[in-house]
Interface confidence: low
Amino acid sequence: MMTGTIETTGNISAEKGGSIILQCHLSSTTAQVTQVNWEQQDQLLAICNADLGWHISPSFKDRVAPGPGLGLTLQSLTVNDTGEYFCIYHTYPDGTYTGRIFLEVLESSVAEHGARFQIP
């Protein structure tokens, strides 16, 4: 039975040319995370595999950085980056958990950055 839940940064906005952190967190399960995929609609952005490490899709390697943790940092944002992003946690024995983030990239300098992190 799948008991886990994924928390995400939710709906976020950022300014064109800026950067944003996409972050998901899997909780309420003891399942082992074997791999995390980051996808933008139907495109694979990056994979973090427990054994093999990170792989960044070549078409995104200049604008995507791994981290923080299992999250993803997008840089040099354009309006074309607006859309849905998915974190897909492959776990054993639970199976697959998916989180959704919607990013809106704004032309205006008053874009509010939704991805805020508190120091633990």
């Epitope: 967190h25 595999n49 490490g53």
Partner: nanobody
Framework: EVQLVESGGGLVQPGGSLRLSCAAS????????MGWFRQAPGKEREWVAS???????WYADSVKGRFTISADNSKNTAYLQMNSLKPEDTAVYYC?????WGQGTLVTVSS
């Protein structure tokens, strides 16, 4: 439990250099990833640089050509060599591995 301990911060004049260290202990699922972030007073935490097992590195545009990130996998330690420091580099610098954060080390660039 993962523990991250940063060191190497301090006061430096503009144009000067500092080398930050981040020692990690405990088990991490990070794909060999370690990163540096910084937070200036009244501002959001900002990504600075990342390094992966195998030597792959990424830098924020604001530090490219001035900062160099590296890692010693045998020591579970990441380093941030900061050259040509500017007053706008003043911030608390945090190390990140596998969703764990250190307590940070303060870097002040001032004459």
């Amino acid at each position: 439990e993962v523990q991250l301990v940063e060191s190497g911060g301090g006061l430096v004049q503009p144009g000067g250099s500092l080398r930050l260290s981040c020692a990690a202990s405990g088990n991490t699922f990070s794909g060999g990833f370690m990163g540096w972030f910084r937070q200036a007073p009244g501002k959001e935490r900002e990504w600075v640089a990342s390094v992966l097992r195998g030597g792959y590195t990424w830098y924020a545009d604001s530090v490219k050509g001035r900062f160099t990130i590296s890692a010693d996998n045998s020591k579970n330690t990441a380093y941030l060599q900061m050259n040509s420091l500017k007053p706008e580099d003043t911030a608390v610098y945090y190390c990140d591995a596998a969703d764990y954060w250190g307590q940070g080390t303060l870097v002040t660039v001032s004459s």
